[in-house]
């Protein structure tokens, strides 16, 4: 039985040209995290963090994605096209797969508010 829950940064907004941290946290389970996948709204993989192999950033995102902090991901040089859903997928033993969702809105405004509150989707 899967007892854990994924907490995410929820709905966040950030300024065009700026950067943002995408963060998920798995709690309420003793399952061991073996891999975390980060996916974009169109299901393209941004990055994978494997317990043994470490981080792999996919070539299309190499220049704009930085691993961390922790199991999170930092998106840099944001464009309007980055607006949309992002998913973290936690592969765990023996629970299986947990999935969290974050919605990022990239704003033209120079005074874009960067809100990052933890919430359970």
């Amino acid at each position: 039985m899967m007892t854990g829950t994924i907490e995410t940064t929820g709905n966040i907004s950030a300024k065009k040209g700026g950067s943002v941290i995408l963060q998920c946290h798995l709690s309420s389970t003793m399952a061991q995290v073996t891999q975390v996948n980060w996916e974009q709204h169109d299901h393209s993989l941004l990055a994978i963090r494997n317990a043994e192999l470490g981080w792999h950033i996919y070539p299309a995102f190499k220049d704009r994605v930085a691993p961390g902090p922790g199991l999170g991901l930092t998106l840099q040089s944001l464009t309007m096209n980055d607006t949309g859903e992002y998913f973290c997928t936690y592969h765990t033993y023996p629970d299986g797969t947990y999935r969290g969702r974050i919605f990022l809105e990239v704003l033209e405004s120079s005074v874009a508010e960067h809100s990052a509150r933890f919430q359970i989707p």
């Epitope: 003793m30 061991q32 073996t34 891999q35 043994e52 592969h91 033993y93 023996p94 299986g96 797969t97």
Partner: antibody, heavy 120, light 107 residues
């Protein structure tokens, strides 16, 4: 080369305790969950449970909650199985087995097994 | 808990025969199933994981398939060294239990 090397056979009296060791080499112990499996003479494989090698937290299968303890010493890359208040029915080969960290999991490396015999 | 029922418990076949062993799960387990071979006096070794993926170094005469909650291990052409007991195991959730085992004898 990944290896799991277990301690040697043990002959114990009923009521005694035993501690079986499983020395991991060729990989980072804390990245892979470790399992314990029992096989009584002439019987099948029984999954006893596992230990989260990242946090040290153990989880036990239903029949192994009472007298069985899984532990780790990461400084010597070794997992342990301790059984207390031994009974004749604990006579078995005990295996440690590493969980592969593919997305579907399986036990990709096994120790050679440790025979524990409980007899008066 | 999800139960695994493995059959047959024993089979005897000739060298070159095609052999199939079945493992049925009481509920859906997706592809979280592995097959192991245990030769007498030895530790088990994984043959198939993810229901259908052949472990590196395992001969190609071994294959796995799935259909709903039924999983099959096939040995396309039995060899003398295949004398062993074969176990299925579910890995989708605690407990990661094994099937009862199938002992394969060479006629």
């Amino acid at each position: 080369e990944v290896q799991l090397v277990q301690s040697g056979s043990e002959l114990k009296k009923p009521g005694a305790s035993v501690k079986v060791s499983c020395k991991a080499s060729g990989y980072t112990l804390t990245n892979y969950p470790m399992n314990w499996v029992r096989q009584a003479p002439g019987r099948g494989l029984e999954w006893m449970g596992w230990i989260n090698t990242n946090t040290g937290s153990p989880a036990y299968a239903q029949d192994f909650t009472e007298r069985f303890v899984f532990s780790l010493d990461t400084s010597v890359t070794t997992a342990y199985l301790q059984i207390s208040s031994l009974k004749a029915e604990d006579t078995a080969v005990y295996y440690c087995a590493r969980t592969a960290i593919t997305s579907v999991y399986h036990f990709d490396y096994w120790g050679q097994g440790t025979l524990v015999t409980v007899s008066s | 808990d999800i139960q695994l029922t493995q059959s047959p418990s024993f089979l005897s076949a000739s060298v070159g025969d095609r052999v199939t062993i079945t493992c049925r799960a009481s509920q859906g387990i997706s592809s979280y199933l592995a097959w192991y071979q245990q030769k007498p006096g030895k530790a088990p070794r994984v043959l198939i994981y993810g229901a259908t993926t052949l472990q590196s170094g395992v001969p190609s005469r071994f294959s796995g398939s799935e259909s709903g909650t039924e999983f099959t291990l096939t040995i396309s052409s039995l060899q003398p060294e295949d004398l062993a007991t074969y176990y299925c195991q579910k890995l989708n959730s605690h407990p990661c239990s094994f099937g009862q085992g199938t002992k394969v004898e060479i006629k």
